[in-house]
Amino acid sequence: ECVTQLLKDTCFEGGDITTVFTPSAKYCQVVCTYHPRCLLFTFTAESPSEDPTRWFTCVLKDSVTETLPRVNRTAAISGYSFKQCSHQISACNKDIYVDLDMKGINYNSSVAKSAQECQERCTDDVHCHFFTYATRQFPSLEHRNICLLKHTQTGTPTRITKLDKVVSGFSLKSCALSNLACIRDIFPNTVFADSNIDSVMAPDAFVCGRICTHHPGCLFFTFFSQEWPKESQRNLCLLKTSESGLPSTRIKKSKALSGFSLQSCRHSIPVFCHSSFYHDTDFLGEELDIVAAKSHEACQKLCTNAVRCQFFTYTPAQASCNEGKGKCYLKLSSNGSPTKILHGRGGISGYTLRLCKMDNECTTKIKPRIVGGTASVRGEWPWQVTLHTTSPTQRHLCGGSIIGNQWILTAAHCFYGVESPKILRVYSGILNQSEIKEDTSFFGVQEIIIHDQYKMAESGYDIALLKLETTVNYTDSQRPICLPSKGDRNVIYTDCWVTGWGYRKLRDKIQNTLQKAKIPLVTNEECQKRYRGHKITHKMICAGYREGGKDACKGDSGGPLSCKHNEVWHLVGITSWGEGCAQRERPGVYTNVVEYVDWILEKTQAV
């Protein structure tokens, strides 16, 4: 059962796993959620009745029954991990904590103009977990405006104390705001020979890489495959670091793979979600339960629904035994990974999908693209919405994209003459416009947020957000698309599609079935040549064939230019403007979404 509220002046008794320090109960809850075993926690706030050495302690707890006895205690705040909840969660913490000094290893000290600049420095430094900044009111003259970058083994402070005129905060790497290089390569036949900070068992290099990404100290990794000559090291995932942040020595060794933490590009790839099945593979660990199940998929469901289950092994049924049901072994360990991995015993193993909600929903697999043809099929573009106006009569107005459970991203020019959000309706999960009847459910629009620098589509800033009155429940036919990460600014997208119900030629009508077209991106320089009378800015992106023939058109406005990269779809552009439709040497012009990520986050995360 999901319990989100915090219990004031309440302490959970027993079940302690470990104690960390956090600046707030809210952040303690996040730390508990991301810990492999924590289900409950007790946080101690600052209070005259409490020993100051216990202030800001966050005790992570576990319980077989998923609950613990409650005891009244002043200044204690307790609660449950979000593991039990179905809503999406994030480690992103933008809060700034006033008059708190978060202790750690101070490895870098420099002058900064503001706490924000200090936080940016931390976010752009590969080792930094959190920072403390002495403001210009700090009593000691030589320490004023000093920005201390800090790290610890756990990523959380080793202690937190009260200190006047300082502020502290965390790196925003987990908010996808780092400008650090994103290095996605996995190097075969390579061992990085730097110091190990931890080791876990993993079924493949991709899982090893994901574990490295969410491990606070891991910057790169080496994985020994199941063919590695030394038997005791097979399936071993070594989590590594170095002073420079880069591997110092690379050794060529067959059957080993190495790669990097994806912490600076984490919003465009799944990090926590290990969704594959591993055939002829047994995961060993502490046994939680043994249940009969029809298939390995059913076993994974059972594991996902059991809050303490971290991974499983399914043994298929022998011939006609047990009504064709096999045995599903639900398992756990101290770190969330198998204690050993064995091959050749016929088991099928995998991980809980409970942690998938810690990744952006937009990274989860969707239906494969249907190649050829121009009509889409249901569920092919689950982020695409149709925006209707009801005034003077109901009609399709523009396209849009689901980017969050209460947010649609679209074009600002769609709202010319729209006096009020009350006349707007957002329909999701729609393939054919003819499906929309009077009783078809829709989302009302609470607020239209148009970029304040928008004047007209051709001059840029053609971007708008719609805040919905109710939240979208994600399903196979309605789910969000990922925003491009600032760390991926330099990605060259080669698999881009424009979709919409718009005209198929300049003088036409709105289409019934959602149309799709694969369109290549065009450089801004090339695009500028085609539009001499306009200024094509870096906040615009162009797409189209030189010979024309495929393009967005009237009615597609506001809809997505969706590009697939590393198996994840990204909202690269918003259909904005162009000269005619599909004309030769006249590419379509789209709002370049990556340039507005900060604006989108600012508007959607505002309290």
């Epitope: 752009d124 590969v126 780092s178 400008n179 650090l180 290089a181 994103c182 290095i183 996605r184 390569d185 190097f187 910057l219 420079s244 942040g245 880069l246 591997p247 110092s248 690379r250 330099n490």
Partner: nanobody, 124 residues
Framework: QVQLVESGGGLVQPGGSLRLSCAAS????????VGWFRQAPGKEREGVAA????????YYADSVKGRFTISQDNSKNTVYLQMNSLRAEDTAVYYC?????????????????WGQGTLVTVSS
């Protein structure tokens, strides 16, 4: 002692091409970031392109994407910047720089070693 030496600059007409080279001694490009930066008179130094030599991951400023290509030859310990479709606004002194830590690839403040620079002038 680390030395980075740029070459290949010169005068070129708009629309033309140039290839800059950066040769290193006392510093190996392998396992490090190498960046090309430029500085026009009266302007701040800006990142143009960078490469992480181990895997060849490349990073470009928006203003040069699609026109400039950064590449490496590890055997010669040299990094190149191929510049096509040059414009007047590309006129600047181009610097090669080496980093010894994991960096924001186009942030000049985070690079440790610098060459003397080579002048590129785009003019008709």
């Amino acid at each position: 002692q680390v030395q980075l030496v740029e070459s290949g600059g010169g005068l070129v007409q708009p629309g033309g091409s140039l290839r800059l080279s950066c040769a290193a001694s006392g510093y190996t490009f392998n396992n490090n970031f190498v960046g090309w930066f430029r500085q026009a008179p009266g302007k701040e130094r800006e990142g143009v392109a960078a490469i992480y030599s181990l895997g060849g991951s490349t990073y470009y400023a928006d203003s040069v994407k699609g026109r400039f290509t950064i590449s490496q030859d590890n055997s010669k310990n040299t990094v190149y910047l191929q510049m096509n479709s040059l414009r007047a606004e590309d006129t600047a002194v181009y610097y090669c720089a080496g980093a010894i830590t994991w960096v924001p690839p186009l942030s000049h403040r985070r690079y440790t070693y610098w060459g003397q620079g080579t002048l590129v002038t785009v003019s008709s």
